[in-house]
């Protein structure tokens, strides 16, 4: 698997998308996990609803949410209030019993907030020793809702 890079701004939200073959992974729950070291295990952060039919419902674990479009074949993970410690390597997974198929390897990069003039020295970027030659960068820089902004359109 190639690694896809998603970049987000500190303090804002980052949306990660993982496309997959909906027919191949039919009926399977999905998960978002964090890679612990280059060859270490992938530690589960959040998984979709226990009932596959309800996979579209957003499930949260702390500041991380997951939702699955099972027909369209897109798993979406939202990292809210992105922090430097959120940077790192993750995986989108399809679960079948004890097996976990990797749908996408994701490298999350946290960029400094251009409006924040504090020291950005603690922000994380992959070091030169880390090889992401095949990485595909997806800029997914989003912003937080402004005060008074309505998250959903009003229903008539």
């Amino acid at each position: 698997h190639n690694t896809t890079v998603f970049q987000g701004v500190a303090g804002q939200s980052l949306q990660v998308s993982c496309p997959y073959d909906s027919m191949k992974h039919w009926g399977r729950r999905k998960a978002w996990c964090r890679q612990l070291g280059e060859k270490g295990p992938c530690q589960r952060v959040v998984s979709t609803h226990n009932l596959w039919l309800l996979s579209f419902l957003r499930r949260w674990n702390g500041s991380t949410a997951i939702t699955d479009d099972t027909l369209g074949g897109t798993l979406t993970i939202t990292l809210r209030n992105l922090q430097p410690h959120d940077a790192g390597l993750y995986q989108c997974q399809s679960l079948h019993g004890s097996e976990a198929d990797t749908l996408r390897k994701v490298l999350v990069e946290v960029l400094a907030d251009p409006l924040d003039h504090r020291d950005a020295g603690d922000l994380w970027f992959p070091g030169e020793s880390e090889s992401f030659e095949d990485a595909h960068v997806e800029h997914s820089i989003s912003r937080s809702l402004l005060e008074g902004e309505i998250p959903f359109p009003p229903t008539s």
């Epitope: 073959d21 191949k24 039919w26 009926g27 019993g97 004890s98 198929d101």
Partner: antibody, heavy 122, light 106 residues
Framework: EVQLVQSGAEVKKPGESLKISCKGS????????IGWVRQMPGKGLEWMGI????????RYSPSFQGQVTISADKSISTAYLQWSSLKASDTAMYYC???????????????WGQGTMVTVSS | EIVMTQSPATLSVSPGERATLSCRAS??????LAWYQQKPGQAPRLLIY???TRATGIPARFSGSGSGTEFTLTISSLQSEDFAVYYC????????FGGGTKVEIK
């Protein structure tokens, strides 16, 4: 009509190789998993492995891992089960089956081939 | 791997009577369970999927129930064509089958 048609019966000697086939028709062959099931004479059903012809992703039952090879050629809508060196204990009926799916998220083997009888005897 | 255990191995029933077949999983398989019928010289036929949903064309006398580790297939009134071997199968982790229950004429 949705169907799976398997190759004919085989009689082989121990140590010989063999490849049997399962051809799908009447549906999108690349979009459904195909499983292989063994039934030894007078015995029950045993799941051997499964393949997704769309990308040839393959899973094996621990009992059959390393004993057989499952493959597929999506250009001719055919799945295969092969042995590099047959044993007398491989004598059995072998079925291929399509893993059907329903809107509830359930899956099960809904379409079955007619079976291929493999006899291994010296 | 998950082990599926069926009981009884053989069930002797008279036509018109009710037959109850059991299937137990070594660990929870949620509702990811199917039942198949196999007659001599024929390929298996899907009866029930998702533990309780009848497959297309399957008569209403066949019903499935249970979830987790305990499952039941009930044939409310046995017809002559129902005498066969029945298998349960889980697809929660792999696709293992039970050993089968032979339903024979009493």
């Amino acid at each position: 009509e949705v169907q799976l048609v398997q190759s004919g019966a085989e009689v082989k000697k121990p140590g010989e190789s063999l490849k049997i086939s399962c051809k799908g028709s009447g549906y999108s062959f690349t979009s459904y998993w195909i499983g292989w099931v063994r039934q030894m004479p007078g015995k029950g059903l045993e799941w051997m492995g499964i393949i997704y012809p769309g990308d040839s992703d393959t899973r094996y039952s621990p009992s059959f891992q390393g004993q057989v090879t499952i493959s597929a050629d999506k250009s001719i809508s055919t799945a295969y089960l092969q042995w590099s060196s047959l044993k007398a204990s491989d004598t059995a009926m072998y079925y291929c089956a399509r893993l059907g799916r329903w809107s509830s998220g359930s899956t099960a083997f809904d379409i079955w081939g007619q079976g291929t009888m493999v006899t291994v005897s010296s | 791997e998950i082990v599926m255990t069926q009981s009884p191995a053989t069930l002797s029933v008279s036509p018109g009577e009710r037959a109850t077949l059991s299937c137990r999983a070594s660990q929870s398989v949620s509702s990811n369970l199917a039942w198949y019928q196999q007659k001599p010289g024929q390929a298996p036929r899907l009866l029930i999927y998702g533990a309780s949903t009848r497959a297309t064309g399957i008569p209403a006398r066949f019903s499935g129930s249970g979830s987790g580790t305990e499952f039941t297939l009930t044939i409310s009134s046995l017809q002559s064509e129902d005498f066969a071997v029945y298998y349960c199968q889980q697809d929660d982790d792999g696709y293992t089958f039970g050993g089968g229950t032979k339903v024979e004429i009493k």
